[in-house]
């Protein structure tokens, strides 16, 4: 996309080099205004690779609470409702940005941090290694 | 762990109420140091609900580039490698936080924004509505 010249109303910044400290308004804007009706929160039960959600809380992090997926089985649920170990349930992971209080216990000073979270599980064909 | 009173080295904050502006160091700390060897980037091909990844770029957002999953099929891949329409491929979505430049085009001023991203796909049993 085209980058337009810096807005003259921007806050002044002394140092333009990385690492740099920026101002962030924590009043979250929600872009998901028309919550997708197709978006289902029961997929974790209906999936052939079902998962449980585990609560992870860290008051030094923003967001403090993250719910993480853990696959229920090593295999996948087949048409009979049994676990088929010829297939594998695996976590789908995503790197997300969070804010970490820095220095610790400060309400208004953070550092960006990248963490890996498991969002759900999917059923995959295993990679079979044939031994010669 | 033990929480000490608010760190005296914290930047001063006038207003503790929402909305509030905080300082964020954009020098990202990566907590995923020992990247999980089990974390596979080929699940999107091996899944019974495979997906493609689409690049979404927005220079007014941080991070500017986000990769989004789109399920390849309405159904799921069966043991024969065919699409089984008795099952559904559905996106696993997650709400993530990003930074949005505010005012626009400012390099050092942002607002937190919540967006919904599709991370991958999973195969679910459809909900069947029986008509009387």
């Amino acid at each position: 996309g085209i980058t337009i010249p810096r807005n003259p109303g921007c806050p002044n910044s002394e140092d333009k080099n990385f690492p740099r400290t920026v101002m962030v308004n924590l009043n979250i804007h929600n872009r998901n205004t028309n919550t997708n009706p197709k978006r289902s929160s029961d997929y974790y039960n209906r999936s052939t690779s079902p998962w449980n959600l585990h609560r992870n809380e860290d008051p030094e992090r923003y967001p403090s609470v993250i719910w993480e997926a853990k696959c229920r089985h090593l295999g996948c649920i087949n048409a009979d409702g049994n676990v088929d170990y010829h297939m594998n349930s695996v976590p789908i992971q995503q790197e997300i940005l969070v804010l970490r209080r820095e220095p610790p216990h400060c309400p208004n000073s953070f550092r960006l941090e990248k963490i890996l979270v498991s969002v759900g599980c999917t059923c995959v064909t295993p990679i079979v290694h044939h031994v010669a | 762990g033990i929480t000490i009173p608010r760190n005296p080295g914290c930047p001063n904050s006038e207003d503790k109420n929402f909305p509030r502006t905080v300082m964020v160091n954009l020098n990202i700390h990566n907590r995923n140091t020992n990247t999980n060897p089990k974390r596979s980037s080929d699940y999107y091909n091996r899944s019974t609900s495979p997906w493609n990844l689409h690049r979404n770029e927005d220079p007014e957002r941080y991070p500017s580039v986000i990769w989004e999953a789109k399920c390849r099929h309405l159904g799921c891949i069966n043991a024969d490698g065919n699409v089984d329409y008795h099952m559904n491929s559905v996106p696993i979505q997650q709400e993530i936080l990003v930074l949005r430049r505010e005012p626009p085009h400012c390099p050092n001023s942002f607002r937190l924004e919540k967006i919904l991203v599709s991370v991958g796909c999973t195969c679910v049993t459809p909900i069947v509505h029986h008509v009387a």
Partner: antibody
Framework: EVQLVQSGAEVKKPGSSVKVSCKAS????????IHWVRQAPGQGLEWMGV????????FYNQKFDGRVTITADKSTSTAYMELSSLRSEDTAVYYC??????????????WGQGTTVTVSS | EIVLTQSPDFQSVTPKEKVTITCSAS?????IYWFQQKPDQSPKRWIY???ELASGVPSRFSGSGSGTDYTLTINSLEAEDAATYYC?????????FGQGTKLEIK
């Protein structure tokens, strides 16, 4: 104005189930978890569990041994707490309370008005 | 589970008096929360994250402590402070509350 409005009082027989609702308004429902806390007559407060309306995740106090189920309906911004296999010791006032997911040190900042559940044969 | 023990269970106090309620945890915790509850009312968040007063709480209240020992202090008691106060921890599951301290005005 933030409000958590709970359903009315219930009288139940031992062995039956009760489902209490908690309708939220005045804030973004999915930004907050809903926790449930109960208080037996003349007693203190007891945490029962939590539901995250955003992900659907739930976590329970093991004391309730699978008897409690907490759910939420995003379309109506309503949380539910169902308690099964009721016994006389479950007679209590049941409260819902919201909890900000992003900055948890704020704690449970708004509570419902409470729902009295009486278990009696 | 972490047991929170409040002291005293009951206190009858004269207006303008200084009041101290303590909350002792069986294991070290990160933060303590205090709730005020009046008869036939829901609990109200009173002090959060050990030190911070909730909106609308008079400045005569304060919170302190760390590790296993926490305190709620009322500098100069007023009639409207008559209530039961509960401490609460959420550092470890299951989340727990103290048994409560009932303050009565003489």
């Amino acid at each position: 104005e933030v409000q958590l409005v709970q359903s009315g009082a219930e009288v139940k027989k031992p062995g039956s189930s009760v489902k209490v609702s908690c309708k939220a308004s005045g804030y973004t429902f999915t930004d907050y978890e809903i926790h449930w806390v109960r208080q037996a007559p003349g007693q203190g407060l007891e945490w029962m569990g939590v539901n995250d309306p955003e992900s659907g995740g739930t976590f329970y106090n093991q004391k309730f041994d699978g008897r409690v189920t907490i759910t939420a309906d995003k379309s109506t911004s309503t949380a539910y707490m169902e308690l099964s296999s009721l016994r006389s010791e479950d007679t209590a006032v049941y409260y819902c309370a919201r909890y900000y997911r992003y900055e948890s040190f704020y704690g449970m900042d708004y509570w419902g008005q409470g729902t009295t559940v009486t278990v009696s044969s | 589970e972490i047991v929170l023990t409040q002291s005293p269970d009951f206190q009858s106090v004269t207006p303008k008096e200084k009041v101290t309620i303590t909350c002792s945890a069986s294991s070290s915790i990160s933060y303590i929360y205090w709730f005020q509850q009046k008869p036939d009312q829901s609990p109200k968040r009173w002090i959060y994250a050990t030190f911070e007063l909730a909106s609308g709480v008079p400045s005569r209240f304060s919170g302190s402590g760390s590790g296993t020992d926490y305190t709620l202090t009322i500098n100069s008691l007023e009639a409207e402070d008559a209530a039961t106060y509960y401490c609460h921890q959420r550092s470890s599951y299951p989340w727990t509350f103290g048994q409560g301290t009932k303050l009565e005005i003489k």
